[in-house]
């Protein structure tokens, strides 16, 4: 009797969670909200954006998605952000977003239309059917890397990094065993797509987790690995410890505060 609980045989069962519930409605609603808030994107037709998004993965095998599939969406979502105000992040998304919410002239990928649309969502389709798979989607490790979500983030991350210029900032999680992880989106995509002809310096902000953690995490071997990769690409590297992220945010909000002249 238990076989009734299984997904029908013809539907591929993947290792990762399925498409986020109400995915089409969520994408459309986010698009409308974003274009209302950002005047420079008011020209965007959200129905067309959804159609292009859908077209990238619907009726396609979810392990056979290419960057090419997302080109119509990329074209519709083309957006100019100040190239010298880009904040990348790795494994510390929440603080990065809190920062750009205060420092409004700086932008993470998720502050752009395409990043905003897809943030925290999962999606995939099925080969030869127009259905969205709400049961399961391919896991990057266990199933395949060329899945709809991974290819999307690889595509938008590459474009975002390619657009950067002057000094690019990256927020890194000092509490992780690998502060810089070569396998992260930052380490595998963004680092290699910064353009030395445009980017002069990558400045890493290493965010400390512990209250009493006064170690210089810029000496971490993985930071030195990042430094080496960046320097070999003819980009200067700068590293700063953010010992007190709470105070750091507070000082971004109130730079005149007398306690904000000391190291944060």
């Amino acid at each position: 009797h238990h076989h009734h609980h299984h997904v029908p045989r013809w539907r591929q069962q993947w290792s990762g969670p399925g498409t986020t519930k109400r995915f089409p409605e969520t994408v459309l609603a986010r698009c409308v909200k974003y274009t209302e808030i950002h005047p420079e994107m008011r020209h965007v037709d959200c129905q067309s954006v959804w159609d292009a998004f859908k077209g990238a993965f619907i009726s396609k095998h979810p392990c056979n998605i290419t960057e090419e599939d997302y080109q119509p969406l990329m074209k519709l979502g083309t957006q100019t952000v100040p190239c010298n105000k880009i904040l990348l992040w790795s494994r510390i998304k929440d603080l990065a977003h809190q920062f750009t919410q205060v420092q409004r002239d700086m932008f993470t990928l998720e502050d752009t239309l395409l990043g905003y649309l897809a943030d925290d969502l999962t999606w995939c389709g099925e080969f030869n059917t127009s259905k969205i798979n709400y049961q399961s989607c391919p896991d990057w490790r266990k199933d395949c890397s060329n899945n709809p979500v991974s290819v999307f983030w690889k595509t938008v991350s590459r474009r975002f990094a390619e657009a950067a210029c002057d000094v690019v900032h990256v927020m890194l999680n000092g509490s992780r065993s690998k502060i810089f992880d070569k396998n992260s989106t930052f380490g595998s995509v963004e680092v290699h797509n910064l353009q030395p002809e445009k980017v002069q310096t990558l400045e890493a902000w290493v965010i400390h987790g512990g209250r009493e953690d006064s170690r210089d995490l810029c000496q971490d071997p993985t930071i030195k690995e990042l430094e080496s990769i960046i320097s070999k690409r003819n980009i200067q590297f700068s590293c700063k410890n953010i010992y007190r992220p709470d105070k750091f945010l507070q000082c971004v909000k109130n730079p005149e505060d007398s306690s904000c002249t000391s190291e944060i």
Epitope: D166, E203, Q219, E227, S228, I230, S231, N234, Q236, F237
Partner: antibody, heavy 119, light 107 residues
Framework: QVQLQESGPGLVKPSETLSLTCTVS????????IHWLRQPPGKGLEWIGV???????DYNPSLKSRVTISKDTSKSQVSLKLSSVTAADTAVYYC?????????????WGQGTLVTVSS | EIVMTQSPPTLSLSPGERVTLSCRAS??????LVWYQQKPGQAPRLLIS???SLETSIPARFSGSGSGTDYTLTISSLQPEDFAVYYC?????????FGQGTKVEIK
């Protein structure tokens, strides 16, 4: 505050090795690269080379065969050795700190030390 | 190596005048250019990096511009303390190279 100071003999004989030391304070050699530059009297500046914070070095190809830069982090000292000197190596020698962790230009300089090559 | 050429070699000017110093690279240096000021018996002092970014404590009368191979340092109104030699440096590729300098002297 950040300070750099060059020291070493002011007179070196031709064919000998010029040896200078740069002593730094106000920052750690594990955090910044140190560059050596020189300026012949009345002339322009020439970059000699750099020792990065991790200990690797880059040298000016025109001097590479004669130059060695090393450091003793615990003493906050960087040394420059230039072998087989000639009168053309007479110059004011400067050490300078890279502006950022791996910086390709210089925000703090030593006051410079004049080295004359003469017999 | 990239050759940096500064012009003119010497400028004779009076306080209050506007000064434009030129620096040309033998190939595109992609805005990797700094300017230094050097006074007799002193080490160079960093003024501007990345073509336009003024170092802290450098007066706003100094400004930089340019792209590709051609770059300019402008002093909007010469002050007595500005008479010195000015060097440009490229940091696009090693060996990092300097111009031969422009001497700004009192007329």
């Amino acid at each position: 505050q950040v300070q750099l100071q060059e020291s070493g003999p002011g007179l070196v004989k031709p064919s000998e090795t010029l040896s200078l030391t740069c002593t730094v304070s106000g920052f750690s050699l594990t955090s910044y690269g140190i560059h050596w530059l020189r300026q012949p009297p009345g002339k322009g500046l020439e970059w000699i080379g750099v020792i990065w914070r991790g200990g690797s070095t880059d040298y000016n190809p025109s001097l590479k065969s004669r130059v060695t830069i090393s450091k003793d982090t615990s003493k906050s000292q960087v040394s420059l050795k230039l072998s087989s000197v000639t009168a053309a190596d007479t110059a004011v020698y400067y050490c300078a700190k890279g502006k950022v962790t791996t910086g390709f230009y210089f925000d703090f300089w030593g006051q410079g030390t004049l080295v004359t090559v003469s017999s | 190596e990239i050759v940096m050429t500064q012009s003119p070699p010497t400028l004779s000017l009076s306080p209050g005048e506007r000064v434009t110093l030129s620096c040309r690279a033998s190939e595109d240096i992609y805005n990797r250019l700094v300017w230094y000021q050097q006074k007799p018996g002193q080490a160079p002092r960093l003024l501007i990096s990345g073509v336009t970014s003024l170092e802290t404590s450098i007066p706003a009368r100094f400004s930089g511009s340019g792209s590709g191979t051609d770059y300019t340092l402008t002093i909007s109104s010469l002050q007595p303390e500005d008479f010195a030699v000015y060097y440009c440096q490229q940091y696009w590729s090693t060996p990092y190279t300097f111009g031969q300098g422009t001497k700004v002297e009192i007329k």
